[in-house]
Amino acid sequence: WQVPRPPTWGQVQPKDVPRSWEHGSSPAWEPLEAEARQQRDSCQLVLVESIPQDLPSAAGSPSAQPLGQAWLQLLDTAQESVHVASYYWSLTGPDIGVNDSSSQLGEALLQKLQQLLGRNISLAVATSSPTLARTSTDLQVLAARGAHVRQVPMGRLTRGVLHSKFWVVDGRHIYMGSANMDWRSLTQVKELGAVIYNCSHLAQDLEKTFQTYWVLGVPKAVLPKTWPQNFSSHFNRFQPFHGLFDGVPTTAYFSASPPALCPQGRTRDLEALLAVMGSAQEFIYASVMEYFPTTRFSHPPRYWPVLDNALRAAAFGKGVRVRLLVGCGLNTDPTMFPYLRSLQALSNPAANVSVDVKVFIVPVGNHSNIPFSRVNHSKFMVTEKAAYIGTSNWSEDYFSSTAGVGLVVTQSPGAQPAGATVQEQLRQLFERDWSSRYAVGLDGQAPGQDCVWQG
C-alpha cells in the first residue's frame, strides 16, 4: 500500500512526493527527541467554549475559556508545526457574502495563521470533500503562503465527510471540539471543546488520526484493508493514557470514526460513547446539536436506535438520570422532534425512570443576516465518572461513514479541591445551559415554531 511520507514536526512533505512505508517502522512523524519531550510532559486540560454574541448568562454562572482566545494562544505557542483537521474553512465574512463585525475574530485568526507561515512554522490542513464552504478562499490564501492542504475525499471513500475538528501543535498541544474553522464558531454559534497543553503522549496519539486523513488526501487514495502499524494507537478504552493533569490523576484516550479509519488499538467513537454511557450509575447529561436514531444522509433513512437504546437502558435499567439538551435553530430539521418526544415519553418518575429532553434555542436577535448560525453546536456528554467531548452529531452516519474524533477523560476526585475534575467542570457547564432560559422543554417547543426564540 503506497502512501506519502507523513510530515515530521518541522516539515510536511509536499503532495507530490509519494513514498512507501515499511510496516512496523517507527512513525515518521514523531520527532527524534520524542522521549525527552514526553518526560517533560506536564499535561493540562482546559475546557473552552464559544458563547454566541448577545446570549447573556446569569451573573456568576460557570464558564470556560473563550475559544477564540484559546486558539490565538495556541498559535502563539507554536514553534514548529500546526496540523489542523476541519470539516471546512470559512474564517472571513466575505466568504459567505456577509459584512458583519462579528467576523473580525475569524479574520484575525486567518491573519495569525499567515504570520505563522511567515515565521517558517509548518501548517498542514486536512479538510473535507464534500465540504460546506465551496466559496471560501481561506485555504487558497494559506496555500499560497506555503501551507500544505489536502482535501480528503470522504464522499468517495466512505460516503461520508471529514467532520473532525482538531489541532495538533508542535506534537505537544491539542485542540479538539465542536468548532469548525469558521468565524461563526467564534462569535455566532455555541461551541464546546478542550485544549490540552504540554501532553506529547496524547498529542502524538491524536496526530496518528491526523495522519490517517493526510494519507487519504493524495490523488487516487484508497482505504487500506489494514492500516500499517505506524498508525496504531497505544491508548484506548481498555488501556487509556494515565497521567497527572495539573497534579490530578487522569486517564484519557481518543476515539475515532468511522471504523474504516480506526487502525489497530483505536477505540471506535460509537464504542467510546456507549462505554461512557454504560459505566454511568448516577447521571448522563448530553448536549448535542442533532439527535436522530436514524441515518441522516441516505435515502430513504434507516432506523438506527443504538444510542437511543443505550440512553433508555441506562434510565430504565439502572435508574440513571438522563438529560439531553439538543440544538434548535433556523436550520434544524424538524423531523427530529418526534424522536425527542419518544425518548422523553419513557420518563416515569414514580418508577424511578428519569429522562428529560430540552432544546436550546439561541435567539437570532439582530443577527438574522448570518446564515447557519445561532445554534448550540456542542457535542459532549458527561457522567459522574467521565467526560466525553466529541465532534459528531448523534445519528448513524457520524459513526459509520463520517470521520470524527472523541476524547474521553476521567479524573479522580481525590487530593484536589471539589469541583476541579474535568467531569465536574463539564457538568457545571451543562447545568448552566440546562437551567438557562434558552433551554426549553419539549412542551414549550410546539411544532411549527421552527426553533424561533419566543422570549
Epitope: 470533500s129 464534500p130 460546506l132 465551496r134 444522509f297 435553530g329 421552527d450
Partner: antibody, heavy 124, light 107 residues
Framework: DVQLQESGPGLVKPSQSLSLTCSVT???????YYWTWIRQFPGNKLEWM?????????NYNPSLKNRISITRDTSKNQFFLKLNSVTTEDTATYNC?????????????????WGAGTTVTVSS | DIQMTQTTSSLSASLGDRVTISCRAS??????LNWYQQKPDGTVKLLIY???RLHSGVPSRFSGSGSGTDYSLTISNLEQEDVATYFC?????????FGGGTKLEIK
C-alpha cells in the same frame, strides 16, 4: 406532499415586465430551502434564474441581475418572479423549484421538488 | 460560470439495454453533480445527487459515477418508462448550471 404550482400570464409584450407566482403547499417557504426559479428555453436548455431563501435573502444569475427580482408573501406561502424589459429571447417555460435541504452540516443540495411549469411567450 | 456539456443530445436504445449518458463540466466540480429526468409531459424528477447517490423512490437500475470534470448516468436495464430527457446540473458554485439534456428513446 410538497407541491409547487406556477401561475401568470402566458403572453407578454416585448419591453414589458413578466410576473409569475409560485404557490407552495405542504411546506413553509420560511423553512430550510432556497425557493428558486428555473426556465427552459425552446430546444430544452435550462437556466437557473435565482432564488429567495427561507430567510428572505436573494441570489440571482448575473446574466439577469439588472432585470430580475424574486420576492415572497409568507402569509400566502407564495413567491414571485418579476423580469423586466423582456424580449422574445425570454420566451420559455418557467418552473419554480426548491433547492436544499439547508440543514446544519448538510453538504448535499439539489432541486427535489419542481412545479409543472408555465409557458410564457414574449410577442407583440 | 461553469459550463455543463452533454455531447449526446439524443440516443436510441432497446428495452433491457444498458445505457450511459455522459456530462462534462468546464472545470473540476468535485462531485457536486445532480441528475434529473424530464418526462415528455414536462414533469421533472431528481434521480441522483452528489454524483452517485440515489434519491428516495428512484429505481436501483439508475446509477451515477464520475469525478473531476467527467460524469455519467447509467440505466442498467432500460424500461419503457425511462423514455425522457436527462439533465446534469452542478451545485459547486453559483450560478447553478445545467447540461443541454440527452433525450432517450426506445428503438
Amino acid at each position: 406532499d410538497v407541491q409547487l404550482q406556477e401561475s401568470g400570464p402566458g403572453l407578454v409584450k416585448p419591453s414589458q415586465s413578466l410576473s409569475l407566482t409560485c404557490s407552495v403547499t405542504g411546506y413553509s417557504i420560511t423553512s430550510h430551502y432556497y425557493w428558486t426559479w428555473i426556465r427552459q428555453f425552446p430546444g430544452n436548455k435550462l437556466e437557473w434564474m435565482g432564488y429567495i431563501s427561507y430567510d428572505g435573502s436573494n441570489n440571482y444569475n448575473p446574466s439577469l441581475k439588472n432585470r430580475i427580482s424574486i420576492t415572497r408573501d409568507t402569509s400566502k406561502n407564495q413567491f414571485f418572479l418579476k423580469l423586466n424589459s423582456v424580449t422574445t429571447e425570454d420566451t420559455a417555460t418557467y418552473n419554480c423549484a426548491r433547492e436544499g435541504p439547508l440543514y446544519y452540516g448538510n453538504p448535499y443540495w439539489y432541486f427535489d421538488v419542481w412545479g409543472a411549469g408555465t409557458t410564457v411567450t414574449v410577442s407583440s | 460560470d461553469i459550463q455543463m456539456t452533454q455531447t449526446t443530445s439524443s440516443l436510441s436504445a432497446s428495452l433491457g439495454d444498458r445505457v450511459t449518458i455522459s456530462c462534462r463540466a468546464s472545470q473540476d466540480i468535485d462531485n457536486y453533480l445532480n441528475w434529473y429526468q424530464q418526462k415528455p409531459d414536462g414533469t421533472v424528477k431528481l434521480l441522483i445527487y452528489y454524483t452517485s447517490r440515489l434519491h428516495s423512490g428512484v429505481p436501483s437500475r439508475f446509477s451515477g459515477s464520475g469525478s473531476g470534470t467527467d460524469y455519467s448516468l447509467t440505466i442498467s436495464n432500460l424500461e419503457q418508462e425511462d423514455v425522457a430527457t436527462y439533465f446534469c446540473q452542478q451545485f459547486n458554485t453559483l450560478p447553478r448550471t445545467f447540461g443541454g439534456g440527452t433525450k432517450l428513446e426506445i428503438k
